[in-house]
């Protein structure tokens, strides 16, 4: 999905209004020291393609983050203000259902929403270019 | 937790540029904007601009975009500011200070200041 | 570039009560519902350090006598009872829009 055509301003008023919450509640107890964040993004279309494949894509030691609180209204921000997002994910989500599992909070998960935290600190704070 | 160390005190003369450097410890350094904000004796604080250290992405407040330059060293957790073609009106001390965790913009974590001072 | 106005540049106020500061934006600093305004208070020779986000929002650790309101252009920092430590200088900040700017600072005082 291409997320050029979003409306950034809306889905960072999401975000910082309930998504981050979340992000902290799934963190707690944890430093915010404890993982280095490694993943960035360039621009705010590149970190929602960055924040979309980290929310919603398995990988390896944590594949159970879809099913979040953060992801889903991740998921809902994105269905109404990128234009055309829920129709790209009928598929993906139908596939997700078929291999849905237990919620188990691995270390790996963790380093996963750091990163992710990373991600959204960066495509709420672009630095502005003055014209 | 995170601290932000600034380098020492300064004296320059008017012409002559100055090299703040501001070193990061305890965290993460590379996915935050850092900012440079100066204040003047008695006065308030001035925004300088910003960079992040993941790209080197820069942005800087107009009015002192030909005379500031911002840095990054990743490897070292530090950020450097530049002001060149100093005046006296440049004497003031110099802030680091990193934003939040959250993406809020608001600066949590600042540097303990340098002093700069420009005088013939 | 959004220029930030405080009032009153200096306050004095008695131990116990209600000190109010204002903050007035050239331009609206709210997006979409939110309002781009931060809260720092300064003590002589510390930086400064933030007092609330987004306009009524308490930074970490911050007693909860500190209190904001406001959006659009018309913000207001409010510190119900006054106590010793809080003799300061308080600042407003935008961060909408580049530059980001702050408030000509108010100072504090006790009666």
């Known amino acids: 999905y291409d997320f050029t055509n979003c409306d950034f301003e809306k889905i960072k008023a999401a975000y910082l209004s309930t998504i981050s919450k979340d992000l902290i509640t799934y963190m707690s107890g944890t430093k915010s020291t404890e993982f280095n964040n490694t993943v960035s993004c360039s621009n705010r279309p590149h970190c929602l393609t960055e924040i979309q494949s980290l929310t919603f894509n398995p990988t390896a030691g944590c594949a159970s983050l879809a099913k979040e609180m953060f992801a889903m209204k991740t998921k809902a921000a994105l269905a109404i203000w990128c234009p055309g997002y829920s129709e790209t994910q009928i598929n993906a989500t139908q596939a997700m259902k078929k291999r849905r599992k237990r919620k188990v909070t691995t270390n790996k998960c963790l380093e996963q929403v750091s990163q992710l935290q990373g991600l959204w600190r960066r495509f709420n704070r672009p630095l502005l270019k003055q014209q | 937790e995170v601290q932000l160390v600034q380098s020492g005190a300064e004296v320059k003369k008017p012409g002559s540029s100055v090299k703040v450097s501001c070193k990061a410890s305890?965290?993460?350094?590379?996915?935050?904007?850092m900012h440079w904000v100066r204040q003047a004796p008695g006065q308030g604080l001035e925004w300088m601009g910003a960079?992040?250290?993941?790209?080197?992405?820069?942005s800087y407040n107009q009015k002192f975009k030909d005379r500031v330059t911002i840095t990054a060293d990743k490897s070292t957790s530090t950020a450097y500011m530049e002001l060149s073609s100093l005046r006296s009106e440049d004497t003031a001390v110099y802030y680091c200070?990193?934003?939040?965790?959250?993406?809020?913009?608001?600066?949590?974590?600042w540097g303990q200041g340098t002093t700069v001072t420009v005088s013939s | 570039d959004i220029v930030m106005t405080q009032s009153p540049d200096s306050l004095a106020v008695s131990l116990g009560e209600r000190a109010t500061i204002n903050c007035r934006a050239s331009?609206?600093?709210?997006?979409?519902?939110?309002?781009?305004m931060h809260w720092y208070q300064q003590k002589p020779g510390q930086p400064p350090k933030l007092l609330l986000y987004?306009?009524?929002n308490l930074g970490s650790g911050i007693p909860d006598r500190f209190s904001g309101s406001g959006s659009g252009t018309d913000f207001t920092l409010t510190i119900s009872s006054l106590q010793a430590e809080d003799v300061a200088v308080y600042y407003c900040?935008?961060?909408?829009?580049?530059?980001?700017?702050f408030g000509q600072g108010t100072k504090l005082e006790i009666k």
């Open positions: 200070a990193r934003e939040d965790d959250y993406g809020e913009g608001y600066f949590d974590v």
């Open positions: 305890g965290g993460t350094f590379s996915t935050y904007n």
């Open positions: 960079i992040y250290p993941g790209n080197g992405e820069t």
């Open positions: 331009e609206s600093v709210d997006n979409s519902g939110l309002s781009f």
């Open positions: 987004r306009a009524s």
């Open positions: 900040q935008q961060i909408n829009t580049d530059p980001l700017t």
